[in-house]
């Protein structure tokens, strides 16, 4: 699987999950998030050669087409597969609130 | 929606579904498919600027991050959203068989 366990331990050029730290205030302008100050959102990048973690029949077909037609511009793209939530603390005035934000952290990638 | 109705009628540079005709024999080397000879598989391509048909919270966050940090290499990618099956005819010896291949045709795209 193209997950953090594999991708963070290997120098992988092809489609893999990459570490990306986002500071809420500096990078997003989100002043309302109190804690954490930032988090590892991660992202997916790298080429999708034929049969690499293909998501659907279409991505397999497109990968094969691309292999047999190297000049073609159509190829699968490396995108998130598994995402996890992030728990944050914010304030409503002086009252603290805890919220779970869904689909915030990329754990693995696929070729789609 | 970034679907064929919209994308095939507009000269859209950003993420959209593009027409792609695949000839089973010539492009894939699939001699076993008798009919059709080929089909419009289509594909997704184009930049994913901030807020364009974002798939998840993560892709919206990544798009916002990319907007506020233009030098960043992390950005969402244009990939298939809705896929449709394709019905094909093939032969097992002299016996014709009809099969529905799932997820063969891209109908719309998203930024993921």
């Amino acid at each position: 699987a193209l997950d953090t366990n594999y991708c963070f331990r290997n120098l992988e050029e092809n489609c893999c999950v990459r570490p990306l730290y986002i500071d809420f205030r500096q990078d997003l302008g989100w002043k309302w998030v109190h804690e954490p100050k930032g988090y590892y959102a991660n992202f997916c990048s790298g080429p999708c050669p034929y049969l690499r973690s293909a998501d659907t029949t279409h991505s397999t077909v497109l990968g094969l087409y691309n292999t047999l037609n190297p000049e073609a511009s159509a190829s699968p793209c490396c995108v998130p597969q598994d995402l996890e939530p992030l728990t944050i603390l914010y304030y409503v005035g002086r009252t603290p609130k805890v919220e779970q934000l869904s689909n915030m952290v990329v754990k693995s990638c696929k070729c789609s | 929606a970034l679907d064929t109705n919209y994308c095939f009628r507009n000269l859209e540079e950003n993420c959209c579904v593009r027409p792609l005709y695949i000839d089973f024999r010539q492009d894939l080397g699939w001699k076993w498919v008798h009919e059709p000879k080929g089909y419009y598989a289509n594909f997704c391509s184009g930049p994913c600027p901030y807020l364009r048909s974002a798939d998840t919270t993560h892709s919206t966050v990544l798009g916002l991050y990319n907007t506020l940090n233009p030098e960043a290499s992390a950005s969402p990618c244009c990939v298939p959203q809705d896929l449709e099956p394709l019905t094909i005819l093939y032969y097992v010896g002299r016996t014709p068989k009809v099969e529905q291949l799932s997820n063969m045709v891209v109908k719309s795209c998203k930024c993921s």
């Epitope: 997003l28 302008g29 989100w30 002043k31 309302w32 914010y90 304030y91 409503v92 005035g93 002086r94 009252t95 919220e99 934000l101 | 901030y50 807020l51 919270t57 919206t60 966050v61 916002l64 907007t67 506020l68």
Partner: antibody
Framework: QVQLVQSGAEVKKPGSSVKVSCKAS????????ISWVRQAPGQGLEWMGG????????NYAQRFKGRVTITADESTSTTYMELSSLRSEDTAVYYC?????????????WGQGTLVTVSS | ETVLTQSPGTLSLSPGERATLSCRAS???????LAWYQQKPGQAPRLLIY???SRAPGIPDRFSGSGSGTDFTLTISRLEPEDFAVYYC?????????FGQGTRLEIK
């Protein structure tokens, strides 16, 4: 700089609903927290609630809970305020405003206002 | 909810004079949860002061805010003709956000 453009005036019957839109220009829609404030003719300002785009966390004034829904559509950089079970005392100018960044905060940019008239 | 009481209800002054507007909260707001707005007829409110004493961008330095706890003041050091309007205080320490009933500043 944020610009907030609201939908046009509405005339509604008692018991019906109204949905007012507020479109933000500029690239930082999802960095803003949007509040809704109303002002009855000749009266003061009254906060109804607010929303954090992207994550769709909404907070409402208790007296409007169950009657008001505030949502955000990131794809169009638009926030909506829907008020149901309208009565004559809901006749007011409804404003959207972006806060300085917190859920409850001062409001630095305001829409032009939308007059909602409730009359039978 | 926190009730904000503004005084006076109406203030009649001449251009060039000093205006002092008061806002009293029914419970302590600390030192940084109060804002002041100016509103003219047919217009949306305009933020003047936030955090009790910080001027919003583009606001002339004749406007200043002070106070903490329950007592806050907006001072306009030297009134200009365009300053005659209605002024509201707003608290954002607790939900719901509340506004004072307003002080009308009129030309004497």
């Amino acid at each position: 700089q944020v610009q907030l453009v609201q939908s046009g005036a509405e005339v509604k019957k008692p018991g019906s609903s109204v949905k007012v839109s507020c479109k933000a220009s500029g690239n930082t829609f999802s960095s803003n927290v949007i509040s809704w404030v109303r002002q009855a003719p000749g009266q003061g300002l009254e906060w109804m609630g607010g929303v954090i785009p992207i994550v769709d966390i909404a907070n409402y004034a208790q007296r409007f809970k169950g009657r008001v829904t505030i949502t955000a559509d990131e794809s169009t950089s638009t926030t909506y305020m829907e008020l149901s079970s309208l009565r004559s005392e809901d006749t007011a100018v409804y404003y959207c405003a972006s806060t300085l960044g917190l859920v409850l905060d001062a409001m630095d940019y305001w829409g032009q206002g939308t007059l909602v008239t409730v009359s039978s | 909810e926190t009730v904000l009481t503004q005084s006076p209800g109406t203030l009649s002054l001449s251009p060039g004079e000093r205006a002092t507007l008061s806002c009293r909260a029914s419970q302590s707001l600390g030192s940084s949860y109060l804002a002041w707005y100016q509103q003219k007829p047919g217009q949306a409110p305009r933020l003047l002061i936030y955090g009790a004493s910080s001027r919003a961008p583009g606001i002339p330095d004749r406007f200043s805010g002070s106070g903490s706890g329950t007592d806050f003041t907006l001072t306009i050091s030297r009134l200009e003709p365009e300053d005659f309007a209605v002024y509201y205080c707003q608290q954002y320490a607790d939900s719901p956000i509340t506004f004072g009933q307003g002080t009308r500043l009129e030309i004497k």
